[in-house]
Amino acid sequence: FNISGCSTKKLLWTYSTRSEEEFVLFCDLPEPQKSHFCHRNRLSPKQVPEHLPFMGSNDLSDVQWYQQPSNGDPLEDIRKSYPHIIQDKCTLHFLTPGVNNSGSYICRPKMIKSPYDVACCVKMILEVKPQTNASCEYSASHKQDLLLGSTGSISCPSLSCQSDAQSPAVTWYKNGKLLSVERSNRIVVDEVYDYHQGTYVCDYTQSDTVSSWTVRAVVQVRTIVGDTKLKPDILDPVEDTLEVELGKPLTISCKARFGFERVFNPVIKWYIKDSDLEWEVSVPEAKSIKSTLKDEIIERNIILEKVTQRDLRRKFVCFVQNSIGNTTQSVQLKEKRG
């Protein structure tokens, strides 16, 4: 199809070589076409309504994305040629940064419903550049955390070094939906809830004497609980004695609950105490058996091929530790009678 009639938009993606980063392009079809093609998302029971600019058809492939090769070859269908680019309804997700993402991307309705729709397309000229050392040293990360229940803010990485007074008008999106009330380089959240997590996009316009373009950055925001102030607790074993049968195999499980920590280095191990000696036992790897927003439960087993008389004189100790402190639970084996 002839792309000369497509509306054109220029975008700049300046990526950090230090961190993983994603990027998105929205199929900004001219109104009113936009409303025909991009699907309005159903709100989940825990989300709050936002301004929804895209609504309409339910079809997953409402729009078609192409890349225009620089050598003048025919347009290429994104889905067939670019595994690191994913189409999600009207959004194109770039999973990895790199100057090789530079180029012209075209989107248009998949179903042409009227003669006018033939010319309904957008050409996005994307320039991708690595961030130079001259750029701000302390720019905001593309992965930002918000502490549940507290006040927080989300900063636009490409503008985080500028004061609010100098900052140009910013357009913010959350999960592809326009946040119409947000216009500054920072979104302030009075009280953080789990629905505040998601993919945020901040856009602002930059110009020179010749042209203007949109500078875009993508921020992955996650909501987290504060780092635990507690040492881990052992949920199992609860009792300090265990009845066993001599000569039979035995598995003793240690299950410990560790509170959330951003830097999580849990320790869970078994050691044996025999009179004045104690030594760590080589046991199977620890494994996570449950994870919630606030904590994680890790299990590690000690396996005895067969219980001996000597084992009855020993203490089996489970030791668990996080950055706050450690806890132990010892188990003494007792022969089952009768």
Partner: antibody, heavy 117, light 111 residues
């Protein structure tokens, strides 16, 4: 929203992979993405989940070994099923939890898997 | 393995009345409160009503109330409406996620 795909009519012993595609949010954040199945006329059955921001996977005791849940991109999660039998015939749902695998606040419409010779 | 036993079906309720559904666990629920309630209508996926035993999910009318702790839980629907006719399921979590399980369901019939 969530959308499941890949449901099909397959023969006993076959394998099948179902895909759950998220729209309006991405799995770069931490979500408990569960797979739940429901046989015709029966109650739902929890299969397992993946914690997207952390990579941990958990399975119901009965599902261990035959079912594998993976995050394949920032918007897709899959359920691989092997050695299928007639007892696996069900509608398979993917569902999202924001704090654990129990408070499932967003569900897809489901995809039907029929195992029959 | 853990088992969640629900009030036998069907349970009848008159419009404007109150209905109570119980869910009993064979072992302690994690944190004594990791239990959710869902409503399901034919041809639809389950819908979250209550999480953490007593917290109301967003958009759910306050006529739905969850209570209980440990092994015994209850869902109460007051001022029953015709639209409440559905099957209700509890879902419980335990120390190990491998034990996560749904209750057998309770059908509510509104007269």
């Amino acid at each position: 929203s969530l959308e499941e795909s890949g449901g099909d009519l397959v023969k006993p012993g076959a394998s099948l992979t179902l895909t759950c595609t998220a729209s309006g949010f991405s799995f770069t954040s931490t979500y408990w993405m569960s797979w739940v199945r429901q046989a015709p006329g029966k109650g739902p059955e929890w299969i397992g989940c993946i914690v997207t921001g952390r990579g941990n996977t958990y399975y119901a005791n009965w599902a261990k070994g035959r079912f594998t849940i993976s995050k394949t991109s920032s918007t897709t999660v899959t359920l691989q099923m092997t050695s299928l039998t007639a007892a696996d015939t069900a509608t398979y749902f993917c569902a999202r939890g924001s704090s654990d695998e129990i408070a499932l606040d967003l569900w897809g419409q489901g995809t039907l898997v029929t195992v029959s010779s | 393995a853990a088992v969640l036993t629900q009030t036998p079906s069907p349970v009848s309720a008159a419009v404007g009345g109150t209905v109570t559904i119980s869910c009993q666990s064979s072992q302690n629920i994690y944190n004594k409160n990791q239990l959710s309630w869902f409503q399901q209508k034919p041809g639809q996926p389950p819908k979250l009503l209550i999480y953490e035993a007593s917290k109301l999910a967003s958009g759910v009318p306050s006529r739905f109330k969850g209570s209980g702790s440990g092994t015994q839980f209850t869902l109460t629907i007051s001022d029953v409406q015709c639209d409440d006719a559905a099957t209700y399921y509890c879902l419980g979590g335990y120390i190990s996620s491998s034990d996560t399980t749904f209750g057998g369901g309770t059908e509510v019939v509104v007269k």
